[in-house]
Interface confidence: low
């Protein structure tokens, strides 16, 4: 007899069918029968746990306790109720050496189990470069292709406009810096984005000295919270005016609220093409 | 500054519930971060008991799931443990904190604990 | 439960002396552990959050490494107020634990 539904898992729920649920009232559905927000549909005799999560595409990568990324939240919690286990968010933003594809449907899919290698040149390959052992001169390759991904103009946090989240995730791996979006549409301020050349491979460019114009206007109004204000902000800036008595909140992309505490489904990202992630 | 304090009996009796309070100062409850509650036996091992979240939801640690319950007063910037049957292994110094944002449960800021002795 | 073990319970060392106490978690936590260090009497007070991260006012001497199993705290230069019970914990997994501690004690 199953102590639980996940006794009964098949690949597309969990079906258990054929024992007497009146002996046992674990398979009639109610708020304790599907784990990790499963959704419980009951047909006839049998009871099965659907993992038909309705995630939206909102690139607001987050890391899991398991070692993979996640598009978004919502792909973490059905990654977790499709292998019925606990995947907290360890940090926002996809994990810094990233070891899974964050669809997380497989077991040792990115389990991002760390193994001891030789320290190397490559080790410092980071925001998606990977590792090219067998070339001259650049070690870190971004074989990121945004050939397909449509127009969706950005703002990123280093000043500069980018025709879609796939570039700036190109720019980010290019450059071996973090670079995120900031914004929907172009930057006030406009610059221009990088190129790769013909290999795969990427130099570093110089860019316009205005680059960081927007950044610095920003500043010149606000300073930053004080420190018992850590956490006044759940996703975003946390800004001082000498204007006002309360501080305020510069929302990161995908978000609102007076706290930044609310998802801003009104915004639509464009995901970027083969990269990193895979989704369900 | 965020501070956090405890406050609650200091004796409580086999079989009754421990009822202890958090006084949060400096920072709204439901403005962010998650409101725990740890334990510190004698022999100075930490248990992390559960959480309050800033909107209201809960995380308990299984193995007090049938006995702990934590709850706020949101008027009063407070939450609330209570631990019903206790035993002589419930005697642990109580404390307090904050958690950090979501993706990071470190605890950044403790109250200054409560000793609570389980005895007759 | 994921079990942290800090497997030495008590180290003796001096004043300026590096110090390195090490945290191994049961499976893996990613980056996802903190640091406290506690002082006789006192609440603790985190030290390293995501395993690597100084928090807020906590001095440069303290530094954290690790990810996956295997962590570390290094104190680069012992101050005579360093001499406390130091713990790890990890929150990769519900219920978030705790190590038994390692207490530095003068030699």
């Known amino acids: 007899f199953p102590t639980s539904l996940s006794d009964c898992q098949t690949p597309t729920g969990w079906n258990c069918s054929g024992y007497d649920d009146r002996e046992n009232d674990l398979f009639l559905c109610d708020t304790n029968t599907c784990k990790f927000d499963g959704e419980c549909l009951r047909i006839g005799d049998t009871v099965t746990c659907v993992c038909q999560f309705k995630c939206n595409n909102d690139y607001v990568p987050v890391c899991g306790s398991n070692g993979e990324s996640y598009q978004n939240e919502c792909y973490l919690r059905q990654a977790a109720c499709k292998q019925q286990s606990e995947i907290l968010v360890v940090s926002e933003g996809s994990c810094a050496t990233d070891a899974g594809s964050g669809s997380g449907d497989g077991v040792h899919e990115g389990s991002g189990e760390t193994s001891q290698k030789e320290t190397s040149t490559c080790d410092i390959c980071q925001f998606g470069a990977e590792c090219d052992e067998d070339a001259e001169d650049v070690w870190c390759v971004c074989n990121i292709d945004c050939s397909q991904t449509n127009f969706n103009p950005l703002c990123a946090s280093d000043g500069k406009s980018y025709d879609n989240a796939c570039q700036i995730k190109e720019a980010s791996c290019q450059k071996q810096e973090k670079i995120e979006v900031m914004s929907l549409g172009r930057c006030q301020d406009n610059t221009t984005t990088t190129t790769k050349s013909e290999d795969g491979h990427y130099a570093r460019t110089d860019y316009a000295e205005n680059a960081n114009k927007l950044e610095e206007s920003a500043r010149e109004h606000h300073i930053p919270c004080p420190e018992h204000y850590n956490g006044f902000c759940m996703h975003g800036k946390c800004e001082h005016s000498i204007n006002m008595q309360e501080p305020s909140c510069r929302c990161d992309a995908g978000y609102t609220g007076q706290h930044c505490e609310k998802k801003d489904y009104s915004v639509l990202y464009v995901v970027p093409g083969p990269v990193r992630f895979q989704y369900v | 500054d965020v501070q956090l304090q405890e406050s609650g009996p200091g004796l409580v009796k086999p079989s009754e519930t421990l009822s202890l309070t958090c006084a949060v100062t400096?920072?709204?409850?439901?403005?962010?971060?998650?409101w725990s509650w740890i334990r510190q036996f004698p022999g100075k091992k930490l248990e992390w008991m559960g959480f309050?979240?800033?909107?209201?939801?809960?995380k308990y640690n299984p193995s007090l799931k049938n006995r702990i319950s934590i709850t706020r007063d949101t008027s009063e910037n407070q939450f609330f443990l209570k631990l019903s049957s206790v035993t002589a292994a419930d005697t642990a110094t109580y404390y307090c904190a904050r958690g950090l944002r979501r993706g990071d449960y470190s605890m950044d800021y403790w109250g200054q604990g409560t000793l609570v002795t389980v005895s007759s | 439960d994921i079990q942290m073990t800090q497997s030495q319970s008590s180290m003796s060392t001096s004043v300026g002396d590096r110090v390195t106490i090490t945290c191994k978690a049961s499976?893996?936590?990613?980056?996802?552990v903190a640091w406290y260090r506690q002082k006789p009497g006192k609440s603790p007070k985190l030290l390293i959050y995501?395993?690597?991260n100084r928090h807020t006012g906590v001095p440069s001497r303290f530094s954290g490494s690790g990810s996956g199993t295997d962590f570390t705290l290094t104190i680069s230069s012992m101050q005579p107020e360093d001499f406390a019970d130091y713990f790890c914990?990890?929150?990769?997994?519900?219920?978030?634990?705790f190590g038994g501690g390692t207490k530095l004690e003068i030699k």
């Open positions: 309050i979240s800033y909107d209201g939801s809960n």
């Open positions: 400096g920072y709204s409850i439901t403005s962010g971060y998650y």
């Open positions: 499976q893996n936590v990613v980056t996802a």
């Open positions: 914990q990890q929150y990769s997994s519900y219920p978030f634990t």
């Open positions: 995501s395993a690597s």
